[in-house]
């Protein structure tokens, strides 16, 4: 059946922690992605940004999780209003920012 929201959020946090802790070389060879507004619809916005990164084994599981948690189909080059279209950041920074925000949501009990 569907993954409970709290479980989904916790699993995603654990995976992002794993990425940040195990990072040796520049994550995804220093690939840049669009920054996003960390608000409602964040899972889809994060996927829309990260789906444009390919060949990066370190974030494959994160992409899978975000794809499962986003209710609609997302393809490369797709953008929502949640993107800060004039700001690109490294994947490593994107992951750190997302992780901090998800931890905050988890502490506050905001699972959806």
């Amino acid at each position: 059946g569907p993954v409970p929201p709290s479980t989904a959020l916790r699993e995603l946090i654990e995976e992002l922690v794993n990425i940040t802790q195990n990072q040796k070389a520049p994550l995804c060879n220093g690939s840049m992605v669009w920054s996003i507004n960390l608000t409602a619809g964040m899972y889809c916005a994060a996927l829309e940004s990260l789906i444009n990164v390919s060949g990066c084994s370190a974030i494959e599981k994160t992409q899978r999780m975000l794809s499962g948690f986003c209710p609609h189909k997302v393809s490369a080059g797709q953008f929502s209003s949640l993107h800060v279209r004039d700001t690109k950041i490294e994947v490593a920074q994107f992951v750190k920012d997302l992780l901090l925000h998800l931890k905050k949501l988890f502490r506050e009990g905001q699972f959806n």
């Epitope: 060879n29 060949g55 370190a58």
Partner: antibody, heavy 118, light 111 residues
Framework: EVQLKESGPGLVAPGGSLSITCTVS????????INWVRQPPGKGLEWLGM???????DYADALKSRLSISKDSSKSQVFLEMTSLRTDDTATYYC????????????WGQGTSVTVSS | DIVLTQSPASLAVSLGQRATISCRAS??????????MHWYQQKAGQPPKLLIY???NLESGVPARFSGSGSRTDFTLTIDPVQAEDAATYYC?????????FGGGTKLEIK
């Protein structure tokens, strides 16, 4: 335009080694995953292994001990090396590039035929 | 390793009729709501061509007569109506777990 082209020795003696090069154009190997797949004459497809853009390498369990995959991103080349060749390694060898997530094999080379025979 | 078993090994379908190919996985290929099963078409003397990804998504440029369905361990590729140019061998492939694996293939003949 995305292109992949395999080049190999054609004929290899049993017990010998095989080296195949996949030369690509139209994209960078630093952000693309390349798979190696083979197909014996008249038979099905067998996944051999892959190298990710970030350098991680995965191998098929059955061939792990005989297989080595590497790349030179600056030359846009991926390499497959196989040791201790047997006659049942005779096949067409393909390199294939994954598309973006969910990483299905979207772009394929034409393949290179390898015969293991004395 | 996840074993993919295709059936039938071969089939002959009349022009304009429906062709149905099955792929059964030895364990689930689902992960976080998606099925990591893909379908390829291979014509004689050519490399494979991606048709369907994530079980049911049509690859760009592939005719709408091709469709995919299924989840967990049971998947189906349907061609309806079959055209003469669809004569080929079809393979399922999973990448839910390493190593990636292919099914044994199904050869489609057009009557």
């Amino acid at each position: 335009e995305v292109q992949l082209k395999e080049s190999g020795p054609g004929l290899v003696a049993p017990g010998g080694s095989l080296s195949i090069t996949c030369t690509v154009s139209g994209f960078s190997l630093t952000d693309s995953s390349i798979n190696w797949v083979r197909q014996p004459p008249g038979k099905g497809l067998e996944w051999l292994g892959m190298i990710w853009g970030d350098g991680r390498i995965d191998y098929a369990d059955a061939l792990k001990s005989r297989l080595s995959i590497s790349k030179d991103s600056s030359k846009s080349q991926v390499f497959l090396e196989m040791t201790s060749l047997r006659t049942d390694d005779t096949a067409t060898y393909y390199c294939a590039r994954d598309g973006r997530f969910p990483y299905a094999m979207k772009f394929w080379g034409q393949g290179t035929s390898v015969t293991v025979s004395s | 390793d996840i074993v993919l078993t295709q059936s039938p090994a071969s089939l002959a379908v009349s022009l304009g009729q429906r062709a149905t190919i099955s792929c059964r996985a030895s364990e689930s290929v689902d992960s976080y709501g998606n099925s990591y099963m893909h379908w390829y078409q291979q014509k004689a003397g050519q490399p494979p061509k991606l048709l369907i990804y994530l079980a049911s998504n049509l690859e760009s440029g592939v005719p709408a007569r091709f469709s995919g369905s299924g989840s967990r361990t049971d998947f189906t590729l349907t061609i309806d109506p079959v055209q003469a140019e669809d004569a080929a061998t079809y393979y399922c492939q999973q990448n839910n777990e390493d190593p990636r694996t292919f099914g044994g293939g199904t050869k489609l003949e057009i009557k």
